[in-house]
Interface confidence: low
C-alpha cells in the first residue's frame, strides 16, 4: 500500500510567492511620471515577475514632521486620487496581485513616527486601517517600528484589526534592527506578523556565517512563517557586491518563508552606478532612456528591456526562481534542513512528503570549491541521493537538466546551484 499523503498546511496568499516593494512611485516610473494611473500600466510587468503582492507607498498626505498635516486617509494629489487607487486595486485583483499599503506616517520627515504625540499617531493608524480595509486593500506595512514607542502593543492592536476584518489580510512591520533578540521580542506578541529587518544585511561574508544566521533565525522563530530580505526597504545592491546578487536571489527564493524584494532588485539596480540618484530610491531603469542625466551611463544590460531579451540575465533568473517558488510544493511549504557542504558553502534541502525535492548549494567565496555534502547532518526523511538533476545555476555554462554526482559537486566562485531529485520511499 502507498504511504498516506501528508496533510497540506493552510496556505495564505503571501505564502505562495514573493512580495515586491515600490516605496517611491516616482522613482519606479521615472520620466517625471510617478502616479497611480501610471503604476496601473506596469502591472503586466509585475505579473511577469510572478510576484504575489505589491507593497505600495506610502502615498498618503504627509507634511514633513507635521502631525496635523498628515492624513493617512487621503492620497497625496501628486500620486493621484482615490479613484485612481480604486482602479489600481481592481486591475491588480484581475491579475492576482495583492496590494499592501504602506502607512508609515511621517515618511517625508525625520522620525517616521514623529517624536511626540504617539497616541494621536496610533489612533490615526487605527482609523486608516479600518478605512483602507473597507477600500479593499490586502494588507499594510509600517516601517521603522524601532522609532515607535510600545511598538509591540500597537502592532498587536493593528494586527487584531487587520485579522478581524479577514484572515486573508496581512500586516508587515519593518525595522532597521539586525539584532535577533530585538526581532524576536517584536515577533513574540504578534503571531502572524510578517517582519522585515536588516538581520541578513551583513551575511555576505561567508557561507558558514550565512548558514549560521539563517539556522539561528529559523530555530528561534520555531514553526512560524517568516519573511526573507536584507532590509525593510533598501535595494540588495546597498548591501551586496554585484557578483553575489544571483546567489542571494536563489537563497531568498528557496528559504522557507516569503521573499521580499524592492523594485529594481530583479535587475540589480544600483544607485551607485547612477550619479546623483538617491541611494534609497534610484530611478528604475526600464530602458536606456530612463536615466538621461548622463548620456551613456546606462547600458542595455542594466535595464529591464535589455535583460528581458537575455535568458542569462539576472532578471531572467529572478523570473525562473519566482516561477519555481510559486508552484513547487517543497519550495512553497516544505521542510528545511541545512547541512555541511564544506568550507565557504551553505547548502540545504527543501522537501515535502512525496513531492519532488530540492537541494540548494551556495558558494559565497571567490574561489571555486568542491562540495562535500555531509548527509550525516540530515534526518532519514531527507536523505540525499547519489545524483540530482541540475534545475539551474546562477552562472552560465552548465547543462541544465543534467544529473550531477553529489560527491563530485564543484562550484565556481559565487555560484549557486538549484538541484532537484525525486522522493524515494
Amino acid at each position: 500500500r502507498a504511504p498516506r499523503c501528508r496533510e497540506l498546511p493552510a496556505q495564505k496568499w503571501w505564502h505562495t510567492g514573493a512580495l515586491y516593494r515600490i516605496g517611491d512611485l516616482q522613482a519606479f516610473q521615472g520620466h517625471g511620471a510617478g502616479n497611480l494611473a501610471g503604476l496601473k500600466g506596469r502591472l503586466d510587468y509585475l505579473s511577469s515577475l510572478k510576484v504575489k503582492g505589491l507593497v505600495l507607498g506610502p502615498i498618503h498626505k504627509n507634511q514633513k514632521d507635521d502631525v496635523a498635516q498628515t492624513d493617512l486617509l487621503q492620497i497625496d494629489p501628486n500620486f493621484g486620487s482615490k479613484e485612481d487607487f480604486d482602479s489600481l486595486l481592481q486591475s491588480a485583483k484581475k491579475k492576482s496581485i495583492r496590494v499592501i499599503l504602506d502607512l508609515t506616517p511621517n515618511y517625508r520627515g525625520e522620525n517616521s513616527w514623529f517624536s511626540t504625540q504617539v497616541d494621536t499617531v496610533a489612533t490615526k493608524v487605527k482609523d486608516a486601517l479600518e478605512f483602507w480595509l473597507q477600500a479593499g486593500v490586502d494588507g499594510f506595512q509600517v516601517r521603522d517600528i524601532e522609532n515607535l514607542k510600545d511598538a509591540s502593543s500597537f502592532l498587536a492592536e493593528w494586527q487584531n484589526i487587520t485579522k478581524g476584518f479577514s484572515e486573508d489580510r496581512l500586516l508587515i512591520a519593518g525595522t532597521n534592527s539586525s539584532d535577533l533578540q530585538q526581532i524576536l521580542s517584536l515577533l513574540e506578541s504578534n503571531k502572524d506578523l510578517l517582519l522585515t529587518s536588516s538581520y541578513l544585511s551583513d551575511s555576505g561574508s561567508t557561507g558558514e556565517h550565512t548558514k549560521s544566521l539563517v539556522t539561528q533565525y529559523l530555530n528561534a522563530t520555531g514553526n512560524r512563517w517568516c519573511s526573507w530580505s536584507l532590509s525593510q526597504a533598501r535595494l540588495l545592491t546597498s548591501f551586496l557586491p554585484a557578483q553575489l546578487l544571483r546567489l542571494y536571489q536563489l537563497m531568498l527564493f528557496t528559504l522557507p518563508g516569503t521573499p521580499v524584494f524592492s523594485y529594481g532588485d530583479e535587475i540589480g539596480l544600483d544607485a551607485a552606478a547612477l550619479p546623483g540618484q538617491p541611494m534609497e530610491a534610484p530611478v528604475m531603469l526600464w530602458d536606456e532612456s530612463s536615466f538621461p542625466d548622463i548620456p551613456g551611463a546606462v547600458s542595455a544590460n542594466m535595464t529591464v528591456k535589455g535583460q528581458s531579451e537575455d535568458p542569462g540575465s539576472l532578471l531572467s533568473l529572478f523570473r525562473r526562481l519566482s516561477d519555481q517558488r510559486s508552484k513547487e510544493r517543497s519550495l512553497l511549504h516544505g521542510d528545511f534542513h541545512a547541512f555541511s557542504a564544506g568550507p565557504g558553502l551553505f547548502s540545504y534541502i527543501r522537501h515535502w512528503d512525496q513531492n519532488e525535492r530540492f537541494l540548494v548549494v551556495l558558494n559565497f567565496g571567490d574561489v571555486g570549491l568542491s562540495a562535500g555534502l555531509q548527509a550525516s547532518d540530515l534526518p532519514a526523511s531527507a536523505s540525499l541521493p547519489a545524483k540530482a538533476d541540475l534545475l539551474l545555476s546562477t552562472q552560465p555554462g552548465r547543462e541544465e537538466g543534467s544529473p550531477l554526482e553529489l560527491e563530485r559537486l564543484k562550484l565556481e566562485p559565487h555560484e549557486g546551484l538549484l538541484l532537484r531529485f525525486p522522493y524515494a520511499a
Partner: antibody, heavy 118, light 112 residues
Framework: EVQLVESGGGLVQPGGSLRLSCAAS????????MHWVRQAPGKGLVWVSR????????SYADSVKGRFTISRDNAKNTLYLQMNSLRAEDTALYYC???????????WGRGTLVTVSS | DIVMTQSPLSLPVTPGEPASISCRSS???????????LDWFLQKPGQSPQLLIY???NRASGVPDRFSGSGSGTDFTLKISRVEAEDVGVYYC?????????FGQGTKLQIK
C-alpha cells in the same frame, strides 16, 4: 595541530584479526570522508578503503572485500579498519588519510605496521 | 579498474636540472565538469606521502612553484623545473575518478 595518528598494528598469524584505529585531532572527523591506504615493505602505495562522513557509504579494494570493514565513531573522532582472515600479503604499513571535499587527500597519518606471519 | 602506469621508474637527476615524470591511465580521468582526477604525491624516505598536485594541475598549498602538473584525459606529466636535494623520494600519481582508487608504481628520483 591538525593530525591523524594510526594505532593497532602488530604481528598476527595468518587467519587472525586486527583492528586499526586512526585518531583525528585539530579538526572534526565527522565533516570528512576518510580512507585507508597501505604500503607493503619496499613497495608502492595501494588504496584499501573509504568511508563517507556519516558512515552510510563504504568502498573497498577487491583484494580486501569481504575481509576488511571500515567504520568510524564521529563522537570519538576516530576511524577504524577491522581486518579479518588476514593473509601474508596484507603485511604493510597502513595509513589513514583525509579526503578534502571530494578533491584530494590533504592529510596523512604516519602509519601503523601490520605484519602477518606464522 | 583503472590502471596507472608511470615512467621512468627510476630518475637520476643533477641538482639544478629539470626533471619530468609521465603518468598514463588506462581510461580518461577527465570528469564531465572539466577536472582531471589525477593527483601527484611525493614520499620522502621514511615519511608519509605528501600531496604535490591535485586535479592534474593545481599545486597544493605550501608546495614550491618549481613543481607543476599538466595533461588531460589519459596523459599526465609532473615537472620539476630545477631539482633540489630535498626533492629526493618516490613520486606517485593517483587517480581518484572512481573506486577503487589506483596509484602508479612510483618513480624514484635520486640525485646524481
Amino acid at each position: 595541530e591538525v593530525q591523524l595518528v594510526e594505532s593497532g598494528g602488530g604481528l598476527v598469524q595468518p587467519g587472525g584479526s586486527l583492528r586499526l584505529s586512526c585518531a583525528a585531532s585539530g579538526f572534526t572527523l565527522s565533516s570528512s570522508w576518510m580512507h585507508w591506504v597501505r604500503q607493503a615493505p619496499g613497495k608502492g602505495l595501494v588504496w584499501v578503503s573509504r568511508i563517507n562522513s556519516d558512515g552510510s557509504s563504504t568502498s573497498y579494494a577487491d583484494s580486501v572485500k569481504g575481509r576488511f570493514t571500515i567504520s568510524r565513531d564521529n563522537a570519538k573522532n576516530t576511524l577504524y579498519l577491522q581486518m579479518n582472515s588476514l593473509r601474508a600479503e596484507d603485511t604493510a604499513l597502513y595509513y589513514c588519510a583525509r579526503w578534502n571535499w571530494g578533491w584530494y587527500f590533504d592529510l596523512w597519518g604516519r602509519g601503523t605496521l601490520v605484519t602477518v606471519s606464522s | 579498474d583503472i590502471v596507472m602506469t608511470q615512467s621512468p621508474l627510476s630518475l637520476p637527476v643533477t641538482p639544478g636540472e629539470p626533471a619530468s615524470i609521465s603518468c598514463r591511465s588506462s581510461q580518461s580521468l577527465l570528469h564531465s565538469h572539466g577536472d582531471n582526477y589525477l593527483d601527484w604525491f611525493l614520499q620522502k624516505p621514511g615519511q608519509s606521502p605528501q600531496l604535490l598536485i591535485y586535479l592534474g594541475s593545481n599545486r597544493a598549498s605550501g608546495v614550491p612553484d618549481r613543481f607543476s602538473g599538466s595533461g588531460s584525459g589519459t596523459d599526465f606529466t609532473l615537472k620539476i623545473s630545477r631539482v633540489e636535494a630535498e626533492d629526493v623520494g618516490v613520486y606517485y600519481c593517483m587517480q581518484t575518478l572512481e573506486t577503487p582508487y589506483t596509484f602508479g608504481q612510483g618513480t624514484k628520483l635520486q640525485i646524481k
